[in-house]
């Protein structure tokens, strides 16, 4: 807390300019009018204030706006944003995408800070849903943003927003998140033709059910092994050798390199060795010839 002291004669600030960098902390407190600061916030960023001086400017704004800053001030905070705490930000009502962009720009190149996370949370909650423009902006600054959301939060993403998602935005998503995103992506891309559809849906396939994988196997998609390895194990297990061969196309020989990794390992264990041998890849671990396969889950359902 800076002491209240009178402003020395002739030092009263008439505008926010470079001369203020020579002011001591107490002089800034005494000589800069908070209302003037609020109207000329856009100038602060261009002036090389010290961190201590910025603390004083923040204090003045806090006194002027105890209930939270108006958006006209927030939009021009610049580096002063880095001085804000999550508690400060929770008082704000940010509705403009331009304001959000301006503040994200300040933090660009750094990991998402608690301040940024709070700002995004306030912004998205204010909008009611994660629309395409917002998602575009957020993933541009933070490629991993989408995967930082809970499945519940992701459920508020409208299918139209999925068009903004790039493959790298999904790199850190877990299966539960893809379970939510996949149906939205399927809906978003439903009017595309076969090959174009596959290019778009590929990144979301970690949430695809068996019947969709079977359908894809009929479309000559040539799925690569990196994508295949991300599929849900429970979705892969019911696929036949012929279906997997069609799904992977020329990439089918890659199964050998991944035969000990899930879901390939578990899928191999469910196939007849005879059928696996037709691939000519040397895959081992299938059900030996002459063995009867009982689907116990089916039997339980019937009893």
């Amino acid at each position: 807390e800076v002491e209240k002291t009178a402003c020395p004669s002739g030092k009263k600030a008439r505008e926010i300019d470079e001369s203020l960098i020579f002011y001591k902390k107490w002089e800034l407190e005494a000589c800069v009018d908070a209302a003037l600061l609020a109207t000329q916030m856009d100038r602060v960023n261009a002036i090389p204030f010290t961190y201590e001086q910025l603390d004083v400017l923040k204090h003045k704004l806090d006194e002027l706006y105890p209930q939270g800053y108006p958006e006209s001030v927030i939009q021009h905070l610049g580096y002063l944003f880095l001085k804000m705490s999550p508690e400060d930000i929770r008082k704000w009502n940010v509705t403009s995408l331009e304001t959000l962009k301006a503040l994200l720009e300040v933090n660009k190149g750094h990991e998402m800070s608690p301040q940024v996370a709070t700002l995004i949370d306030r912004f998205v909650k204010g909008r009611g849903q994660l629309d395409k423009d917002t998602l575009d902006t957020l993933t541009a600054f933070y490629p991993g943003y989408l995967c930082s959301l809970s499945p519940e939060e992701l459920s508020s993403v409208p299918p139209s927003s999925i068009w903004a998602v790039r493959p790298q935005d999904l790199d850190t998503c877990d299966p539960r998140q893809l379970d939510v995103l996949y149906p939205k992506a399927r809906l978003a891309f439903q009017n595309m033709n076969g090959s174009e559809y596959f290019v778009k849906i590929q990144s979301f396939l970690g949430g695809a059910p068996t019947e969709d994988l079977k359908a894809l196997s009929q479309q000559n998609v040539s799925m690569d092994l990196a994508t295949f390895m991300k599929l849900r194990t429970d979705a892969v297990l019911p696929l036949t050798v012929a279906e997997v061969q069609k799904l992977l196309g020329p990439h089918v020989e890659g199964l050998k390199a991944e035969e000990r990794h899930r879901p390939v390992r578990d899928w191999i264990l469910r196939q007849r060795q005879d059928d696996l041998d037709t691939l000519g890849l040397g895959l081992q671990g299938g059900i030996p010839n002459g063995y009867l396969v009982l689907d116990l889950s089916m039997q339980e359902a019937l009893s």
Partner: antibody, heavy 119, light 108 residues
Framework: EVQLVQSGAEVKKPGASVKVSCKAS????????MDWVRQAPGQGLEWMGD????????IYNQKFSGRVTMTEDKSASTVYMELSSLRSEDTAVYYC????????????WGQGTTVTVSS | EIVLTQSPDFQSVTPKEKVTITCSAS???????LSWYQQKPDQSPKLLIY???NLASGVPSRFSGSGSGTDFTLTINSLEAEDAATYYC?????????FGGGTKVEIK
């Protein structure tokens, strides 16, 4: 440019553990498995195991089972190899090597990390 | 596990001469699953040939590979000074993946 940059040399006492990191850059991290291969002084190459950075799934050479643990941090595009209960014969250069998912050959290697186990 | 035995262990060769290194497997290896690596002193290994005969990116055409079943060969058609290195064969046809013991090629 595709690069695998490993952590620096380590000197450990018998019975201790060592954790080597391998940071990947210049490619899509989740499209490639990361394998670990070691080379004892004046000896040949020995495959230790691999990790799929996308799923976190690991496969270990049985020779190291129970002693080796491979982990990944997708957000940092980094994989780790930890070897525990070290003995003098674990003295070696440890390499991480990139392997495209669906292939079995290593097209890019890290610079190697020398681990010396000595009392 | 499949044991890969390389021969010779060591070879001293004059430049421009042809070099042949063999890799013999203790049981059959599917040819798509065999590769060769080159390692120069104090350097990491480098992929030379994959799938028995495919040259890796940037590898000079004087290198070639062949073979099937249990017998595989790496050939350097006209040795150059920069080829002084140790060469390893590697199989991923059977778990665990294994490497040959290496063949050191020295320039006379």
């Amino acid at each position: 440019e595709v690069q695998l940059v490993q952590s620096g040399a380590e000197v450990k006492k018998p019975g201790a553990s060592v954790k080597v990191s391998c940071k990947a850059s210049g490619y899509t991290f989740t499209d490639y498995n990361m394998d670990w291969v070691r080379q004892a002084p004046g000896q040949g190459l020995e495959w230790m195991g691999d990790i799929n950075p996308s799923t976190g799934g690991t496969i270990y050479n049985q020779k190291f089972s129970g002693r080796v643990t491979m982990t990944e941090d997708k957000s940092a595009s980094t994989v780790y190899m930890e070897l525990s209960s070290l003995r003098s014969e674990d003295t070696a250069v440890y390499y991480c090597a990139r392997r495209r998912i669906g292939t079995g050959y290593f097209d890019v290697w890290g610079q190697g990390t020398t681990v010396t186990v000595s009392s | 596990e499949i044991v890969l035995t390389q021969s010779p262990d060591f070879q001293s060769v004059t430049p421009k001469e042809k070099v042949t290194i063999t890799c013999s497997a203790s049981s059959s290896v599917i040819s798509s699953y065999l590769s060769w690596y080159q390692q120069k002193p104090d350097q990491s290994p480098k992929l030379l040939i994959y799938r028995t005969s495919n040259l890796a990116s940037g590898v000079p055409s004087r290198f070639s590979g062949s073979g099937s079943g249990t017998d595989f060969t790496l050939t350097i058609n006209s040795l150059e000074a920069e080829d002084a290195a140790t060469y390893y064969c590697h199989q991923w046809s059977s778990f665990p993946y294994t490497f040959g013991g290496g063949t050191k090629v020295e320039i006379k």
